[in-house]
């Protein structure tokens, strides 16, 4: 008995698609061995049609594929555009066709039901609208028009021109008779139900002179589109429900074990808390279509999703829906990165953002997720250098360390910086990731003066105190601009007196500007890093003024512990040109700047090695 298992019989109709899932014991050998789908011939040989090694026979070219899911011990064979020639006996298996582990599958593709001559076929998805056209002759123009449904040998009246409406179609059907000269009447049925499926008969007039036309109405359940995405990655559900429901509330829901559908997000402002910080419902187009983006995919996000339209913002029978079956692949190409990063007020965080390493030239972005209404994510910074004004001097996007990861540094943290942020590029949308910044109790590790006024033409010395725990780190000073932070030469001044509980390893590293020029005005960061990996930073604003008193100016170490002065940036509303974003609708049309909050100086970020999912921790 073979341990491979699958459907013994698959039946479908011409033009349809099938998705055949085969199961195997997920041993290490089985997971990585060749998977195949072959057709059994009269000779008993089984001819490969598609395999996991990329082979696709000419008969299947452009209409079939095989996808392996090693973590589940399954593989799926998708075959589209079925014809009756595809009927036959097949095997799905592992290894070599002739002697591997396999399972027999019978595929039967039928023509579909025989219909009376001249029958018009209408194929419509459940919940949508159908317009049945019924021609008639001139002599029947003044006579009664009607639509019947054939049930077995009987015909049941559905609607007629004398205002009769069958109760099963109440409030969702209308019969239209055009003006003179047009010899056709139409019946429009809205919000189609599965039970509407069947053969209908249009009739105009009565007796032997009556006009008749058969209509076959095929109401289809939405076939779930199979969606395979990587753990930690992102999925986008594109939902196009038609103009008929363009102005009706939209929703995405997830089918649960009780056969109901829990709203994940809708346009009425409802959102499942499990998706907090990692979901956006993009604004509708004029045609009523919309999309939902979910980032930071988890294994528990797997399941059947439906999008739909209804005034209540939730699933109702007879309204249009679209369906997806989401599978989350645990053998993910997206690397693990912290989902939570912790910092202290006045401190800093350095966030690592993954991107598809094949797209090193793509533009990188960082945005702040906002939960109001359908969610939006205004851009804060991009790799070309644009930074929202209120983040001036405290936010930078660095291409380092590269090879699939970029870094975002945010300092001068306040409690208002707590929240969810998204890393994204203008390339592969599946690599969008979410990180939550939490502000915890503690003091910044790096100590710098609150603000500094330098005198034109003189020497300025700015100290930065590093605690002993950073003894092995590289220390640096850089000048911030909206295109990055340009490293400057700095000087190690020896042990720092700012950390009394520390030994010789605590350092004072200063930046010297000599002589001070007008161009020196601006933000300066001192920070630590290890190779291309950035740690904590602290920011100082240097103002430059005219010379008043002769002599050089030195900011004493004592002043470094003084409370930093507040610097409030322009908090006005600002448009950000949303350049090069693959799906600009991901972001709201207006980029509204959040409240700037307190712009205190100082810096702190920490890495807690106790969890692969979190960065941070309180001060040591």
């Amino acid at each position: 008995k073979s341990p491979v298992f699958g459907p013994q019989e698959v039946s479908s109709v011409e033009g349809n698609s099938v998705s055949i899932k085969c199961y195997y014991p997920p041993t290490s050998v089985n997971r990585h061995t060749r998977k195949y789908w072959c057709r059994k011939g009269a000779s008993g040989r089984c001819i490969t049609l598609v395999s996991s090694e990329g082979y696709v026979s000419s008969n299947y070219a452009g209409r079939a594929n095989l996808t392996n899911f090693p973590e589940n011990g399954t593989f799926v064979v998708n075959i589209a555009q079925l014809s009756r020639d595809d009927s036959g006996h097949y095997k799905c298996g592992l290894g070599i066709n002739s002697r591997g582990l396999s399972f027999d599958v019978s595929l039967e593709v039928s023509q579909g039901p025989e219909l009376p001559n001249g029958t018009e076929v209408y194929t419509v998805d459940v919940g949508r609208t159908v317009t049945i056209k019924c021609p008639f002759k001139t002599e029947n123009a003044p006579k009664t028009k009607a639509l019947y449904k054939k049930i077995g040998q009987t015909s049941v009246l559905v609607i007629d021109s004398r205002n009769y409406v069958n109760p099963n179609y109440k409030d969702r059907i209308r019969l239209r008779i055009p003006g003179t000269g047009q010899l056709i009447f139409t019946v429009v049925i809205d919000r189609l139900r599965l039970s509407d499926h069947g053969l209908y008969l249009c009739q105009a007039g009565d007796g032997s002179n009556r006009d008749e036309k058969n209509a076959d109405l095929q109401v289809l359940e939405p076939e779930p589109e199979l969606v395979y995405e990587d753990l930690r990655g992102s999925v986008t559900f594109h939902c196009a429900l038609g103009l008929e429901v363009a102005n009706v509330a939209k929703f995405l829901c997830r089918v649960n074990s009780r056969e109901t559908c829990d709203v994940v997000i809708n346009t009425l402002g409802k959102r499942d808390s499990a998706f907090e910080g990692r979901i956006l419902l993009n604004p509708q187009d004029k045609d009523g279509s919309f999309s939902v983006v979910i980032t930071g995919l988890r294994k528990e996000d797997e399941g059947r999703y439906l999008c739909g339209a209804h005034s209540d913002g939730q699933l109702q029978e007879g309204w249009p829906i679209q369906a997806w079956q989401l599978f989350v692949n645990e053998e993910s190409t997206i690397p693990r990165s912290p989902t939570v990063v912790k910092g202290v007020a006045g401190g800093s965080v350095a966030v690592l953002c993954p991107y598809n390493p094949k797209e090193s030239q793509s533009l990188k972005y960082w945005c702040l997720w906002e939960g109001a209404q359908n969610g939006r994510c205004p851009l804060l910074v991009e790799s070309q250098g644009l930074v929202q004004e209120q983040y001036e001097g405290r936010l930078s996007l660095l291409q380092e360390p590269g090879n699939g990861t970029f870094t975002v540094i945010l300092n001068q943290l306040t409690t208002q910086d707590a929240g969810f942020y998204w890393c994204l590029t203008n390339g592969d949308t599946r690599w969008r990731t979410t990180v939550e910044i939490k502000i915890i109790e503690g003091e910044p590790n790096l100590k710098v003066p609150g603000n500094v006024t330098a005198v034109l033409g003189e020497t300025l010395n700015i100290p930065c105190h590093f605690p002993c725990k950073f003894s092995s780190y590289e220390k640096y000073w850089c000048k911030w601009s909206n295109t990055g932070c340009q490293t400057l030469p700095s000087q190690d001044e020896g042990p720092s007196e700012a950390f009394v509980n520390c030994d010789e390893n605590s350092r004072l590293v200063s930046l010297t500007l000599n002589p001070v020029t007008r161009a020196d005005e601006g933000w300066y960061w001192c920070g630590v890093k290890q190779g291309h990996f950035y740690g904590e930073t602290a920011a100082v604003y240097v103002a430059v003024e005219e010379k008043k008193v002769a002599g050089s100016r030195y900011v004493s170490p004592a002043k470094a512990d003084a409370a930093p002065d507040e610097k409030v940036l322009d908090s006005g509303v600002r448009e950000i040109e949303n350049k090069a974003i693959q799906d600009p609708r991901l972001f709201a049309e207006e980029k509204v700047v959040a409240d700037t909050g307190d712009q205190a100086g100082g810096s702190r970020a920490s890495v807690d090695s106790s969890s692969s999912e979190e960065q941070g921790g309180s001060s040591k």
Epitope: E9, V10, S12, N16, N72, L220, E223, R304
Partner: nanobody
Framework: QVQLVESGGGLVQAGDSLRLSCAAS????????MGWFRQGPGKEREFVAT??????????YYTDSVKGRFTISRDNAKNTVYLQMNSLKPEDTAVYYC?????????????????WGQGTQVTVSS
């Protein structure tokens, strides 16, 4: 909610046939698959057959011991699933349960079915 009601069980001789029916009512429009499980005296409940569907495509799964003897089918209009059992054997004696699922990652697993009927007794005497 979805309600499942089985019928068609009974006492038959070995080699005879029986047809079980399972009628579903309630919110069946999101149902993705329906199947039959059985529990013999003193045994665990086990998978017998399942039918899943997507539009007009049907997928039928059977356990090895019933292949070629049992046939699962469905009537979409009546929301009913049938199990035609031919060439019955004494070892087929069991309570047969109908089950329905919204999402099936593996049709053989009991815990993937969200709804269960009360069961119908099938007894095959030799």
């Amino acid at each position: 909610q979805v309600q499942l009601v089985e019928s068609g069980g009974g006492l038959v001789q070995a080699g005879d046939s029986l047809r079980l029916s399972c009628a579903a009512s309630g919110r069946t429009f999101t149902t993705y698959g329906m199947g039959w499980f059985r529990q013999g005296p003193g045994k665990e409940r086990e998978f017998v057959a399942t039918i899943t569907w997507s539009g007009s495509t049907n997928y039928k799964y059977y356990t090895d011991s019933v292949k070629g003897r049992f046939t699962i089918s469905r009537d979409n209009a009546k929301n009913t699933v049938y199990l035609q059992m031919n060439s019955l054997k004494p070892e087929d004696t069991a309570v047969y349960y109908c089950a329905a699922s919204t999402v099936l990652t593996d049709p053989r697993r009991l815990n993937e079915y969200d709804y269960w009927g009360q069961g119908t007794q099938v007894t095959v005497s030799s």
